[in-house]
């Protein structure tokens, strides 16, 4: 039975040209995290494996930085970066947990962080 929950940074906004940290946290399970995949819609951004380190997809390599931790930093944001981002936790023996973050990139300087929320 999958007992874990993923806590994410929820709905967030950031300024065009700025950067943002996408973070998820898996809790309430003793399952071992084998790797975390970061995806945007149907595109792979990055993979983090505790032992093998990071893979950054080449189409994002100039604008994505690994970390902090299992999180991902998006840099030089554009309005085209607005959309859904997913952290996919591959765990043993539970299986896969997915968290969702919605990022809105704003033209103005008014960019506030949304509240945290949980996905079971």
């Amino acid at each position: 039975m999958m007992t874990g929950t993923i806590e994410t940074t929820g709905n967030i906004s950031a300024e065009k040209g700025g950067s943002i940290i996408l973070q998820c946290h898996l809790s309430s399970t003793t399952a071992q995290v084998t790797q975390v995949n970061w995806e945007q819609q149907d595109q792979l951004l990055a993979i983090c494996n505790a032992d093998l380190g990071w893979h950054i997809s080449p189409s994002f390599k100039d604008r994505v930085a690994p970390g902090p931790g299992l999180g991902l930093t998006l840099q030089s944001l554009t309005v085209n970066d607005t959309g859904e981002y997913f952290c996919i936790y591959h765990t043993y023996p539970d299986g896969t947990y997915t968290g969702r973050i919605f990022l809105e990139v704003l033209e103005s300087s008014v960019a506030e962080h949304g509240a945290r929320f949980q996905i079971p």
């Epitope: 084998t34 790797q35 995949n37 995806e39 149907d42 595109q43 792979l44 993979i47 494996n49 505790a50 032992d51 093998l52 380190g53 990071w54 893979h55 950054i56 997809s57 080449p58 189409s59 390599k61 690994p66 591959h90």
Partner: antibody, heavy 119, light 107 residues
Framework: EVQLQQSGPELVKPGASVKISCKTS????????MHWVKQSHGKSLEWIGG????????TYNQKFKGKATLTVDKSSSTAYMEFRSLTSEDSAVYYC????????????WGQGTTLTVSS | DIVMTQSHKFMSTSVGDRVSITCKAS??????VAWYQQKPGQSPKLLIY???YRYTGVPDRFTGSGSGTDFTFTISSVQAEDLALYYC?????????FGGGTKLEIK
């Protein structure tokens, strides 16, 4: 120039163990994970697992857990793979291969080590 | 485990021909796919990574395309030295897996 120099061919008896080495040069050994790949005669490639030379952390293909042990010697920039309880099914060519930086692709491979298990 | 299926074990072609090798993943692997070339008696060599990126020094007659479950490796004008085995490889999730290989034979 990046080089991965593997140890020579091995002929061993069933039930024995063998340790294959992969001596590297031309790059910062601890900054890139090292992997091992099996190629049975006339067959495809199988990923055995990888090791982070900096931390010693390993990730294995479940199929090879308990069969293969990956280690490194940082002082000599050498990676090792020990194979135990050998059977004829383990007869194959084994390659070490390093990953690209921040990408899960093998950019350099050793020349391969042929392992023959026979009584 | 993700199974990578290369439907053709052998492909026969002539120098100058265009040839395409296909690879199908048993589940969506996004673009986490590479293509390797292995010439007789040699170690594999990286040609294409992330489905469509040509590795440094690889001639531009080699191209890759696809995403999700269907991937294609193409040689636009086959040369005699392209006689080799070609493997697809996924790293979307461990254990990383390879296709069964396609042997390119020159007529």
């Amino acid at each position: 120039e990046v080089q991965l120099q593997q140890s020579g061919p091995e002929l061993v008896k069933p039930g024995a163990s063998v340790k294959i080495s992969c001596k590297t040069s031309g790059y910062a050994f601890t900054e890139y994970t090292m992997h091992w790949v099996k190629q049975s005669h006339g067959k495809s490639l199988e990923w055995i697992g990888g090791i982070n030379p900096n931390t010693g952390g390993t990730t294995y293909n479940q199929k090879f857990k308990g069969k293969a042990t990956l280690t490194v010697d940082k002082s000599s920039s050498t990676a090792y793979m020990e194979f135990r309880s050998l059977t004829s099914e383990d007869s194959a060519v084994y390659y070490c291969a390093k990953l690209l930086r921040l990408m899960y692709y093998f950019d350099y491979w050793g020349q391969g080590t042929t392992l023959t298990v026979s009584s | 485990d993700i199974v990578m299926t290369q439907s053709h074990k052998f492909m026969s072609t002539s120098v100058g021909d265009r040839v395409s090798i296909t690879c199908k993943a048993s589940q969506d692997v996004r673009t986490a796919v590479a293509w390797y070339q292995q010439k007789p008696g040699q170690s594999p060599k990286l040609l294409i990574y992330s489905a469509s990126y040509r590795y440094t020094g690889v001639p531009d007659r080699f191209t890759g395309s696809g995403s999700g479950t269907d991937f294609t490796f193409t040689i636009s004008s086959v040369q005699a030295e392209d006689l080799a085995l070609y493997y697809c490889h996924q790293h979307y999730i461990t254990p990383w897996t390879f296709g069964g290989g396609t042997k390119l034979e020159i007529k």
